[in-house]
């Protein structure tokens, strides 16, 4: 029985050219996290973090993605095309798979504030 819940940074905004932290957190389960996959709205992989073997950063993002903090991901040099959904998929044992969603809006405005809060989707 899957008892866990994924908390995410929810809907966030950041300014063009800046950076943003994509963060998910799995709670309410004792399941062991074996791997976390980070994917973009079009199903393209940004990165995978294996609990023991570390990070795999996909080539299309290698110059713009920094691993961490923790199981999260930092997306840098934001463009308007980065606007959209991002998904964290937690592979766990014995529970199975948990998935969280974050919506990122990249704003042109130089005064855009980066708002981030943890919420349960």
């Amino acid at each position: 029985m899957m008892t866990g819940t994924i908390e995410t940074t929810g809907n966030i905004s950041a300014k063009k050219g800046g950076s943003v932290i994509l963060q998910c957190h799995l709670s309410s389960t004792m399941a062991q996290v074996t791997q976390v996959n980070w994917e973009q709205h079009d199903h393209s992989l940004l990165a995978i973090r294996n609990a023991e073997l570390g990070w795999h950063i996909y080539p299309a993002f290698k110059d713009r993605v920094a691993p961490g903090p923790g199981l999260g991901l930092t997306l840098q040099s934001l463009t308007m095309n980065d606007t959209g959904e991002y998904f964290c998929t937690y592979h766990t044992y014995p529970d199975g798979t948990y998935r969280g969603r974050i919506f990122l809006e990249v704003l042109e405005s130089s005064v855009a504030e980066h708002s981030a809060r943890f919420q349960i989707p």
Epitope: L45, L53, H56, P67
Partner: antibody
């Protein structure tokens, strides 16, 4: 130049154990993961597992848990794989392979170690 | 475990021909696929990573494509030295698994 030099061929009896080494040179050992791959005669490749030399963390293919143990010696930049309770099914060529930087593919391979289990 | 199926165990081709080797994953693996070449008596060599990226020093006659469950490895103009077995591998989830291999034979 990156090199992965594996220990020589082994002929062992059923039920015994064996430890295969993979001595590396030409790069910073702790910055890359190390993996072990099995190739039975005339067959495909099987990922046994990998180890992060930086912290000793290991990830195993469930099929090889209890069969293989992966370790490293940072001081000599050497990776080891111990295989125990050997049977004829374990007869194969075993490769060590380096995980590419921030990637999971294997960019450098050892020359292979042939293990023969026979009474 | 994710099963990687290379439907052709053998493929026969001539020097200068274009040849494509296919690999099918039992579930969606996005672009987490690698292609290796293993020549007779040698260790495998990395050719393509992340489905379509050519590894350093690999000739541009070798290309990879695909995403999801269907992947293709192509040699645009086969050379005699391309005689080898070609393996696909997924690293979308552990255990990382290989296809059964496709042996390329030169006529």
């Amino acid at each position: 130049e990156v090199q992965l030099q594996q220990s020589g061929p082994e002929l062992v009896k059923p039920g015994a154990s064996v430890k295969i080494s993979c001595k590396t040179s030409g790069y910073t050992f702790t910055e890359y993961t190390m993996h072990w791959v099995k190739q039975s005669h005339g067959k495909s490749l099987e990922w046994i597992g990998g180890i992060n030399p930086n912290n000793g963390g290991t990830s195993y293919n469930q099929k090889f848990k209890g069969k293989a143990t992966l370790t490293v010696d940072k001081s000599s930049s050497t990776a080891y794989m111990e295989l125990r309770s050997l049977t004829s099914e374990d007869s194969a060529v075993y490769y060590c392979a380096r995980g590419a930087y921030y990637r999971y593919d294997f960019d450098y391979w050892g020359q292979g170690t042939t293990l023969t289990v026979s009474s | 475990d994710i099963v990687m199926t290379q439907s052709h165990k053998f493929m026969s081709t001539s020097v200068g021909d274009r040849v494509s080797i296919t690999c099918k994953a039992s579930q969606d693996v996005r672009t987490a696929v690698v292609w290796y070449q293993q020549k007779p008596g040698q260790s495998p060599k990395l050719l393509i990573y992340s489905a379509s990226y050519r590894y350093t020093g690999v000739p541009d006659r070798f290309t990879g494509s695909g995403s999801g469950t269907d992947f293709t490895f192509t040699i645009s103009s086969v050379q005699a030295e391309d005689l080898a077995v070609y393996y696909c591998q997924q690293h979308y989830s552990t255990p990382w698994t290989f296809g059964g291999g496709t042996k390329l034979e030169i006529k």
